[in-house]
Amino acid sequence: SLLPVPYTEAASLSTGSTVTIKGRPLACFLNEPYLQVDFHTEMKEESDIVFHFQVCFGRRVVMNSREYGAWKQQVESKNMPFQDGQEFELSISVLPDKYQVMVNGQSSYTFDHRIKPEAVKMVQVWRDISLTKFNVSYLKR
Amino acid sequence: SLLPVPYTEAASLSTGSTVTIKGRPLACFLNEPYLQVDFHTEMKEESDIVFHFQVCFGRRVVMNSREYGAWKQQVESKNMPFQDGQEFELSISVLPDKYQVMVNGQSSYTFDHRIKPEAVKMVQVWRDISLTKFNVSYLKR
């Protein structure tokens, strides 16, 4: 069954945590659907963003942070492991120095920490996708 | 009650036709939700686009056409009559020489015909909005 989109869930992250998302683009890549995953510092959508991950399917991925309401330096990648019309599994792992983004089991993007992952309180998944799975796994202490 | 998004409906347009859309952005303008309305030449989403209207709420509007799979010259406007968090009513009227886009009863954008409006067979409304009304009115002969 489908999860609502935008999908918002409270989350606490630290080294070893992994966010797993399963979904499918809602349009063909020619029409440039988007997927966005945002790690927020508060439960409010206007809050700052520790890690912003946006896919323009078929074109590019941009990553960034939003600090005190201002977007910072954008990191862009043309790597496009997503397949037109196909379901994807995305996992974002919190490593000691960075986020590692896996797409369908393949390491595809990294983003160095700018803000401590412990500052994350909420994860939002949204834009032009249907969502079938969202999970945050916590490293056992 | 809400209409599904993406929302797709068969349509035949000519001078005097008006497409009316009521909806609401799914996120605050700080997060830059999008609204897109596409007038297609076929019932398929990969088909050419006679009139492409895309709002990045709070930032800008772009209009264009997609012909034989290729995007043409983009027309951009910074005019932003949409209100953060508020419902909008959008109407797109087919005039003899152009499309006229009204937002909440106010003439806000125009786009000169590049392709005959009679070539339109389908309208799609999508991206980051909830949709409560979609209507195509035809001029009585």
């Epitope: - | 012909e67 020489d97 590049r114 392709i115 005959k116």
Partner: antibody, heavy 122, light 107 residues
């Protein structure tokens, strides 16, 4: 009343570059939604579109001439220019500049210059 | 050869109706324009958007299109209408094509 006037050398040697300028008076070449075209007409023959520059500065060229064509503009002097490289005698023609609202395929070209004859010969 | 095909010549008696055709365009999608040109002069736009007349063009000029054929009609042709006529359309909105031209003779 919008007027335009083509100017440039009337004689160009083969393999050289043909350069023409169109000076527009009575309206700005950056006025929204207007495009500015070059068209040519060989002696005794029909019209051939070469390309245009839009109000935004973007260009579009005829596929058959694209590899040799460049259209640019000088907004401070309200002029736009044509450069056609590697010319041959087949490029001998009257060259016209013209204006169109928005897409020329929709609205046609409503104002034309008088035309200037360019002969390609050694 | 032109992407749009016109008859090379059409004759009409003074006061009668002349029809000039233009074939081979995608007129279901793209509009057609028509120009008249007299010797030694620049072309003049007489019809745009299939059937619209610019200011100053006499009402006897009209246009239509259907499928792959567009037609320029001159109702009650005058001696001054003797000229070359060109159709113009597009293979896309940013690629302009002209017809080969038709010489109209008014008898």
């Amino acid at each position: 009343q919008v007027q335009r006037q083509e100017s440039g050398p009337g004689l160009v040697k083969p393999s050289q570059t043909l350069s023409l300028t169109c000076t527009v008076s009575g309206g700005s070449i950056t006025t929204n939604y207007y495009s500015w075209s070059w068209i040519r007409q060989p002696p005794g023959k029909g019209l051939e579109w070469i390309g245009y520059i839009a109000y935004s500065g973007s260009t579009s060229y005829s596929p058959s001439l694209k590899s040799r064509t460049s259209i640019s503009r000088d907004t401070s002097n309200n002029q736009f220019s044509l450069q056609l490289s590697s010319v041959t005698p087949e490029d001998t023609a009257v060259y016209y500049c013209a204006r169109s609202r928005s897409s020329p395929t929709t609205f046609g070209m409503d104002y034309w210059g008088k035309g200037t004859l360019v002969t390609v010969s050694s | 050869s032109s992407a749009l095909t016109q008859p090379s010549a059409v004759s009409v008696s003074l006061g009668q109706t002349a029809r000039i055709t233009c074939q081979g365009g995608n007129f279901g999608r793209y509009y057609v324009s028509w120009y008249t040109q007299k010797p030694g002069q620049a072309p003049v736009l007489v019809i745009y958007q299939d059937s619209e007349r610019p200011t100053g063009i006499p009402e006897r000029f009209s246009g239509s299109s259907s499928g792959d054929t567009a037609t320029l009609t001159i109702s009650g042709a005058q001696a001054e209408d003797e000229a070359d006529y060109y159709c113009q359309s597009g293979t896309s909105s940013d690629n302009i094509v002209f017809g080969g031209g038709t010489h109209l003779t008014v008898l």
